[in-house]
Interface confidence: low
Amino acid sequence: AGVFELQIHSFGPGPGGAPRSPYSARGPCRLFFRVCLKPGLSEEAAESPCALGAALSARGPVYTEQPEAPAPDLPLPNGLLQVPFRDAWPGTFSLIIETWREELGDQIGGPAWSLLARVTRRRRLAAGGPWAGDIQRAGAWELRFSYRARCELPAVGTACTRLCRPRSASRCGPGLRPCAPLEDECEAPPVCRAGCSLEHGFCEQPGECRCLEGWTGPLCMVPVSTSSCLGLRGPSSTTTGCLVPGPGPCDGNPCANGGSCSETPGSFECTCPRGFYGLRCEVSGVTCADGPCFNGGLCVGGADPDSAYICHCPPGFQGSNCEKRVDRCSLQPCRNGGLCLDLGHALRCRCRAGFAGPRCEHDLNDCAGRACANGGTCVEGGGAHRCSCALGFGGRDCRERADPCAARPCAHGGRCYAHFSGLVCACAPGYMGARCEFPVHPDGVSALPAAPPGLRPGDPQRYP
């Protein structure tokens, strides 16, 4: 078991690509990617399912194209695309990466998504190796990406078929005494040929050095693309020793049904129009074998061959290919200003302070039916309800008899007297103020605010 990981680095017009986007007339959009893995390098079975697995990326940031502006690299979704595989990693595989464009404007008469580009690579790759980089052209577009396969413990090895047993395991049969701890049974990786590139080479037998795709040489140090003669076909030139151009794999356009041809080392690749698949775009129509249902949709054969499949979408998705996330929050199910969260499998409402319930329907701060005792009045505000209590009472519901002097509010030795409308401080000599907080100078003038008219230092100060 293990995981195939794909990292998309950029997607945009290739060199000499479209001067401006062919989609510029449309409104805001965002990209997402679909990856499909098929075992083996065979060119047959173009319609075979993604037997090794498939994955769909998150949607990328929203991008609004400027009608006359050059098409830039389009903003990409974050994160890796990960395709778990259950069984052995086959080593040779076909990697299909589809770039999809999701329209966000009002869509009239058609799906809100379209396939921008589809690249298919046939590759050899050992599990546990480093990231392999690639650049692929699809029509006017260029896709840059890296990928790798890694095993998940306890599986190890280039095919993830060897099971690694940690040292602590023991191998005793039933009823036998415990054995001595085993030596680590995880096989050490074979020692490759001295100097074999750690990045671009790998080995399965000691002393060998096998190169990852795109690298060559005895130590896998030479990138295939650096050869000065690469890409030229035909008879050898006597002057340079290089090949002179001959007929190319795209000559005569082997791509059927309007597919566009791009050359790959020693071969060609067809970028097919919508509704066509296969090495030469020769497969028309889409069936369940193509894996057309996104987001975990279940594909079944349609009763009508003009729609040869039907996608049964999981909760939270809709569209003929389950490609559209249902915006269940647009119905504003959360009341009282609650924040709506669509978790895919369920809706959640994050309620504002003072509200509760699955849809924030319960107002915890509601004065309705909430009595304040002992003549207190209920006041709503600040996201909470409170009782404004009559004098002499306190607490959340004004049920507690309040002693205004309990908190010893009179400073500098002033004495506190409970009063029908609050409390009164009788200040010690030399202090004045509602709480006896201000010292009085010997000349009878206060150091801070002037005493209110009619009050002299030492008089009781009433604190409302």
């Epitope: 047959e44 079975a45 173009a46 319609e47 008469g109 058609g110 059927a256 049904n257 309007g258 129009p273 919508r274 509704g275 296969g278 020769e282 497969v283 028309s284 129509g285 069936t287 074998a289 054969g301 009508d304 061959p305 003009d306 040869a308």
Partner: antibody
Framework: EVNLEESGGGLVQPGGSMKLSCVVS????????MSWVRQSPEKGLEWVAE??????????HYAESVKGKFTISRDDSKSRLYLQMNSLRPEDTGIYYC???????WGQGTLVTVSA | NIVMTQSPKSVSMSVGERVTLSCKAS??????VYWYQQKPEQSPKMMIY???NRYTGVPDRFTGSGSATDFTLTIRSVQAEDLADYHC?????????FGSGTKLEIK
């Protein structure tokens, strides 16, 4: 109920032209790729041409034998499919059927006879 | 072009018998194969799509099978109303092509 009804067939001289029409009801015409298929005793069933949707810019495909001679078109607002046939030859004789793209729905056919 | 070859050219069966019609493609067409029934003086009618899917309203005595190059239409218990020509066709690649048909006659 799905119904496709062809019209416009008849007798035409070699080298002549003819335009077939097909009116569709019972399904959303604008959502379907459409084709013309012909049938003759000599050649049996023979696919002639296909037209896709507005979202595909009404892309068309033709059998090699009619390329450059026949033109398929559609009018989604009228749910109509057309086949303009030029430079007709005797081997173009047959019953012409209007069909949905994977031939689930068929009209009753219209007979085209190319003869001097 | 992909050639679809049907056999036999014609077959005569009694009511209640089982009949098997064959269609061979000149190259791999996956499961993009269709079977049509054409009764005298009528237009073809779809019976099977995707090699093995029975079309809406088609009786379950009709069964399609096969993939790649060899395809079969089986009628489990032939009825008098099954008298017709049966055509296979492929939509795997352009141009779409049809077989020349098998005529089913009832004894």
């Amino acid at each position: 109920e799905v119904n496709l009804e062809e019209s416009g067939g008849g007798l035409v001289q070699p080298g002549g032209s003819m335009k077939l029409s097909c009116v569709v009801s019972g399904f959303t015409f604008s959502n379907y790729w459409m084709s013309w298929v012909r049938q003759s005793p000599e050649k049996g069933l023979e696919w002639v041409a296909e037209i896709r949707l507005k979202s595909d810019n009404y892309a068309t495909h033709y059998a090699e034998s009619v390329k450059g001679k026949f033109t398929i078109s559609r009018d989604d607002s009228k749910s109509r499919l057309y086949l303009q046939m030029n430079s007709l030859r005797p081997e173009d004789t047959g019953i012409y059927y209007c069909t949905s793209n994977r031939f689930a729905y068929w009209g009753q056919g219209t007979l085209v006879t190319v003869s001097a | 072009n992909i050639v679809m070859t049907q056999s036999p050219k014609s077959v005569s069966m009694s009511v209640g018998e089982r009949v098997t019609l064959s269609c061979k493609a000149s190259e791999n067409v996956g499961t993009y194969v269709y079977w049509y029934q054409q009764k005298p003086e009528q237009s073809p009618k779809m019976m099977i799509y995707g090699a093995s899917n029975r079309y809406t309203g088609v009786p379950d005595r009709f069964t399609g099978s096969g993939s790649a190059t060899d395809f079969t239409l089986t009628i489990r218990s032939v009825q008098a109303e099954d008298l017709a020509d049966y055509h296979c066709g492929q939509s795997y690649s352009y141009p779409f092509t049809f077989g020349s048909g098998t005529k089913l006659e009832i004894k």
